[in-house]
């Protein structure tokens, strides 16, 4: 179950992922999983003491059950 | 509110087995992978499963794995933990929790486990 | 499997005291490292994800810091409900693994 190391890479300007576009690389695992990628900006979340390491974006938690994992609530809306 | 409520728990003997229980309410429950974690009397927090939330993928910890089943109903909101063989180190608070997530691009990062069960107890003692 | 080494084990401190609690990795991970606080007969409660954000809800008293195999966890000033357990989380590979815990004690 343990995969190779992750590039920081990745992180700061990830590539393309191996996934065809109704899917998404799941970092955990290394692998596709099924996604949807409907999303809109939010800042960053209040109180955080540095940049959270990603774009703050707020997938939507519906669509066709999306990257479901990726539904998730945050703090500091506009 | 966002709320897991677990049951299942009980006294049980070496060799035999025990499913766990997990109701979400508060949430789309079918859209977020799922958490099994223990921690035995005095002792450090041990992950235990993971489910996604399709039920497509599932992980277990060594410790469990070939013994223990995570699945989920998605039509009733429930996770469950399917126990069999038990054993004395199995003695330990089980907690379920929500898999906790953000899509960052087409990249999923995981960002540990939100939302908490309130735990449950299984002993198994002969 | 990626082990998690958290120091102090214990401490003992005052209300309004600053707190610093450690946590190292085996190897790199980045900053997949979340932090919780539990306190006895509850829960794990989630504090701070992906090595400094903080989760919602949780007090601006707690941060933290730190990338690659180290990591912090401080309160800049400990309040009475902060007498707790805190435990470090990595989120980098399966198996998820943590720290064995940092508990804060009143002096």
């Known amino acids: 179950m343990r995969r190779g190391p992750r590039s920081l890479r990745g992180r700061d300007a990830p590539a393309p992922t191996p996934c065809v576009p109704a899917e998404c690389f799941d970092l955990l695992v290394r692998h596709c999983v099924a996604c949807g990628l409907l999303r809109t900006p939010r800042p960053k979340p209040a109180g955080a003491s540095s940049p959270a390491p990603r774009t703050a974006l707020q997938p939507q938690e519906s669509v066709g059950a999306g990257a479901g994992e990726a539904a998730l609530p945050l703090p500091g809306l506009l | 509110e966002v709320q897991l409520v677990q049951s299942g728990g009980g006294v049980v003997q070496p060799g035999r087995s025990l499913r766990l229980s997990c109701a979400a309410s508060g949430f789309t429950f079918s859209s977020y992978g799922m958490h099994w974690v223990r921690q035995a009397p005095g002792k450090c927090l041990e992950w235990v499963a993971v489910i996604w939330y399709d039920a497509s993928n599932k992980y277990y910890g060594d410790s469990v794995k070939g013994r223990f089943t995570i699945s989920r109903d998605n039509s009733k909101n429930t996770l469950y933990l399917q126990m069999n063989s038990l054993r004395d180190e199995d003695t330990a608070v089980y907690y379920c929790?929500?898999?906790?997530?953000?899509?960052?691009?087409?990249?999923?990062?995981?960002?540990?486990?939100?939302?908490w069960g309130q735990g449950t107890t299984v002993t198994v003692s002969s | 499997e990626i082990v998690l080494t958290q120091s102090p084990s214990s401490l003992s401190a005052s209300v309004g005291d600053r707190v610093t609690i450690t946590c190292r990795a085996s190897q790199s991970i980045s900053s997949y490292l979340n932090w919780y606080q539990q306190k006895p007969g509850k829960a794990p409660k989630l504090l701070i994800y992906a090595a400094s954000s903080l989760q919602s809800g949780v007090p601006s008293r707690f941060s933290g810091s730190g990338s690659g195999t180290d990591f912090t966890l401080t309160i800049s000033s400990l309040q009475p409900e902060d007498f707790a357990t805190y435990y470090c989380?990595?989120?980098?590979?399966?198996?998820?693994?943590f720290g064995c815990g940092t508990k804060v004690e009143i002096k």
């Open positions: 989380q990595q989120s980098y590979s399966i198996p998820l693994t």
């Open positions: 929790a929500r898999r906790f997530t953000h899509l960052r691009g087409q990249y999923i990062e995981d960002y540990g486990l939100d939302v």
